[in-house]
Amino acid sequence: FERTRSLQDPCSNCPAGTFCDNNRNQICSPCPPNSFSSAGGQRTCDICRQCKGVFRTRKECSSTSNAECDCTPGFHCLGAGCSMCEQDCKQGQELTKKGCKDCCFGTFNDQKRGICRPWTNCSLDGKSVLVNGTKERDVVCGPSPADLSPGASSVTPPAPAREPGHSPQ
């Protein structure tokens, strides 16, 4: 029965970009300005998204598809379909409740977005700090202290080749 009814439903003939107008004997009427229907058989058209303020229009609304927004320079998109615009900060900063603030000592952020993350703890992997961290960069871990003892292998670039029969002191 349901299938038979849907076959007889005049609204199912209304294509995308139109709606089935109950006030006009279920005639397919074009979507009014600033509205769209992306599928056929719709009884109403949806209001187009407006890109205002920090939101910029990336793609205009049409009768069959919604507008798409991105963010004005200095802001970046968050969420599906750019549902939010969030201010960029500088590298070495994070966005807090009071705006962009420098990363605390021991943390870094190498991007214009996101939060400050703790420096890698080299000692957890049995390694030593090769290059100190900054607000913008993580530490670089080097060989473990044991690797640096004489005669031990190292992750530093190999020394120039020696003559056969000579061992490193």
């Epitope: 998204r49 205002k52 303020g53 920090v54 939101f55 927004c69 802001f75 968050l78 969420g79 379909g81 750019c82 549902s83 939010m84 615009c85 969030e86 201010q87 966005l95 807090t96 409740k97 009071k98 705006g99 962009c100």
Partner: nanobody, 122 residues
């Protein structure tokens, strides 16, 4: 329909003062946090000040101590009192709802006014 209408912009000398108003309609103003942002040609948007529904406020470092945001829930209006204006304050100022209540963030359901121009010139 939701409407935000800014007024009070104009030409002012450096060191002068202006009061911007934003008249809201079409929503329950008293329960919304509100914001002022500005757009400097060629420099993009920056947030200026925020005010929560309870009246607590936040300011950008660049305007702290010079600008004051306030609201009158009986008049459905938010204000920006600007003192000691500088050349770098010259911009189009926008009033907007602030649903995210995260500094520097607006969402797609926020409403924006049309903006009012503030020109600082000697």
């Amino acid at each position: 329909a939701v409407q935000l209408v800014e007024s009070g912009g104009g030409l002012v000398q450096p060191g002068g003062s202006l009061r911007l108003s934003c008249a809201a309609s079409g929503f329950t103003f008293s329960s919304y946090a509100m914001s002022w942002a500005r757009q400097v040609p060629g420099k993009g948007f920056e947030w200026v000040a925020y005010i929560y529904s309870d009246g607590s406020t936040y300011y950008a470092d660049s305007v702290k101590g010079r600008f004051t945001i306030s609201r009158d829930n009986a008049k459905d209006t938010v204000y920006l009192h600007m003192n000691s204006l500088k050349f770098e304050d010259m911009a189009v100022y926008y009033c907007a709802t602030w649903r995210s209540q995260q500094v520097g963030r607006w969402d797609e359901y926020d409403h924006w006014g049309q903006g009012t121009q503030v020109t600082v010139s000697s």
